[in-house]
Structure formats: C-alpha cells, structure tokens
C-alpha cells in the first residue's frame, strides 16, 4: 500500500545569460509530446554540466517552464516549444514552476500525485510552533505570579 | 535508467552494406533522443549521426552523409543505422547514445557530453 504524495508548488522568476554553448538543458513535453499525463507542459529533463541553468544552479530537472520571456508555454507543439528557447535572445527570463514531492505515510513509488495537496508537516509546524510559544508564555505568567 | 544494446556489427567488404540496431530499455522511448557515435582504434569517439524523439528530424555528420540513414521505430523501442557504399574508413566501433529531451541549444546533437546514456558498442570492419 502507498501513502499518498504531496507537492509543495512554488513558482520562481529565473534569469539566465546564454553561455558560449547556450542555456544547457534539455526539454520534453508539448501537446504532441506529454511527458506527464494529462499536462501537455514543458518540462526540463536534463540540465547540463558547466552549462547557463547549471552554473546559476536554480532550475532543476523536473521543474515545469511555464513562459519564456513573457511568453506562455501553454498548447504548444514540442518543436515549437523548442525553437522559442533557440530564438529566446542572450538574455532569458523564465518563469518557472518548482515541485517539492513530499511523500506521506508507507514510502511508495513516485507517482503523478495530487499537485494541489497540502504537505502533512505544513499544518503540524506551524501547530507545533504556537503549541511551544503558548507554553513558553505560559510559565512566563507564572513566574509572574 | 536507460539500457542501450547495440547489435548487427560484423566483418563486411568494401561497397557492401550493414544495418545496426540498437535497443533501449528503461525509460518511455519516446521521449529519448538518439544518437550514434563511433570510435576507430587510437582515434577519438565521432559523431555519426542523430535522430530526434519522433524521427522527424535527423542530421549526419558529413563523413557519412548520402551513404548513412538513421530512423527509428518507436513501437519496437528501437533506432538504426543503414549503412551503404562501406568503406574501409568506416571501420570503427560503433556506439549508440541516449539523452532524455531536446536540447533548447542549437548544435548540441554532435557532442558526447550531451548524452546521458550508452551501450557497449558493436564492431563494424570493413576490409
């Protein structure tokens, strides 16, 4: 039996200068080429070594790219999705979609999951957090007294 | 993890033919960019030619262009490699490689760096 897998989705502005061998990483995806099911989105699969994306260190494999220079990356072919990074310029701005797998209860496969969930440990930190200053306050009102 | 078998070398005359095949495994084919590279003894490992994920787009290097013709068969999670007009300088083993994605830089098809995954290499000699 598997536990369910969470993401905690978080979205990033990342500015890379195209290097003497360009922007140096790989993309799959596009409506012709789903490579997650049901998300006909852009996503990277290899980053490479000594590369731009690699020596800034933000983008990761896995990320989502959701535009390119303001551009939307939605319904597009992967040739074209393609040929919009080639023609990007020196200067690229991409908005990107960073997803943190955050797996509950028995360890199971990597599956697609529920991008929507909330991580367990979001709602127990912050609980955990006010439960140590209530008793912090606590004995400070009783030395008080 | 990708696997790579490469298959079909053999001894072969000069003007003669060979088709070589490479078989992945491991990963969804589809989404895999393939290559061949080859070696000759005491010589660096050269590209020879590319194919994209759905085999719309090839390039060759010019050594072996209007002789060579890469393809691929995703059904069968398989790439090739006809090879006509041998010649004994074609002589060389020959390697398949693997990268998951397009690159979104022009030109990267012909560097071994950007490939992840390799098999072991099959003979070709043509003598």
């Known amino acids: 039996m598997n536990g369910r897998v969470d993401y905690l989705v978080t979205e990033e502005e990342i500015n890379l200068t195209r290097g003497p061998s360009g922007l140096g990483f790989n993309i799959v995806g596009g409506t012709d080429q789903q490579y997650v099911s049901n998300d006909s989105g852009i996503y990277v699969s290899r980053i490479k070594e000594n590369g731009a994306a690699a020596l800034d260190g933000r983008l990761q494999e896995g990320d989502k790219i959701l535009s390119v220079n303001g551009q939307d990356l939605k319904n597009l072919l992967h040739q074209d999705a393609v040929d919009l990074f080639r023609n990007a310029g020196y200067a690229v701005s991409l908005r990107v979609q960073h997803r943190l797998q955050v797996q509950n209860g028995p360890i199971g496969h990597r599956g697609e999951g529920d991008p929507s969930g909330i991580p367990i440990f979001m709602v127990l930190v912050p609980v955990f957090a006010l439960t140590m200053v209530a008793a912090w306050a606590f004995m400070r009102y009783r030395q008080q007294l | 993890h990708v696997q790579l078998v490469e298959s079909g070398g053999r001894l072969v005359q000069a003007g003669g033919s060979l088709r070589l095949s490479c078989a992945a495994s491991g990963r969804t084919f589809t989404h895999l960019n393939m290559g061949w590279f080859r070696q000759a003894p005491g010589k660096e490992r050269e590209f020879t030619a590319h194919i994209n994920w759905s085999g719309g787009s090839t390039n060759y290097a010019d050594s072996v262009k209007g002789r060579f013709t890469i393809s691929r068969d995703n059904a069968k999670n398989t790439v090739y490699l006809q090879m006509n007009s041998l010649k004994p300088e074609d002589t060389a083993v020959y390697y398949c490689?693997?990268?998951?994605?397009?690159?979104?830089?022009?030109?990267?098809?012909?560097?071994?760096?950007?490939?992840?995954?390799w098999g072991q290499g099959t003979q070709v000699t043509v003598s």
């Open positions: 490689a693997a990268t998951l994605g397009d690159s979104v830089d022009l030109d990267s098809d012909a560097d071994p760096r950007g490939y992840d995954y």
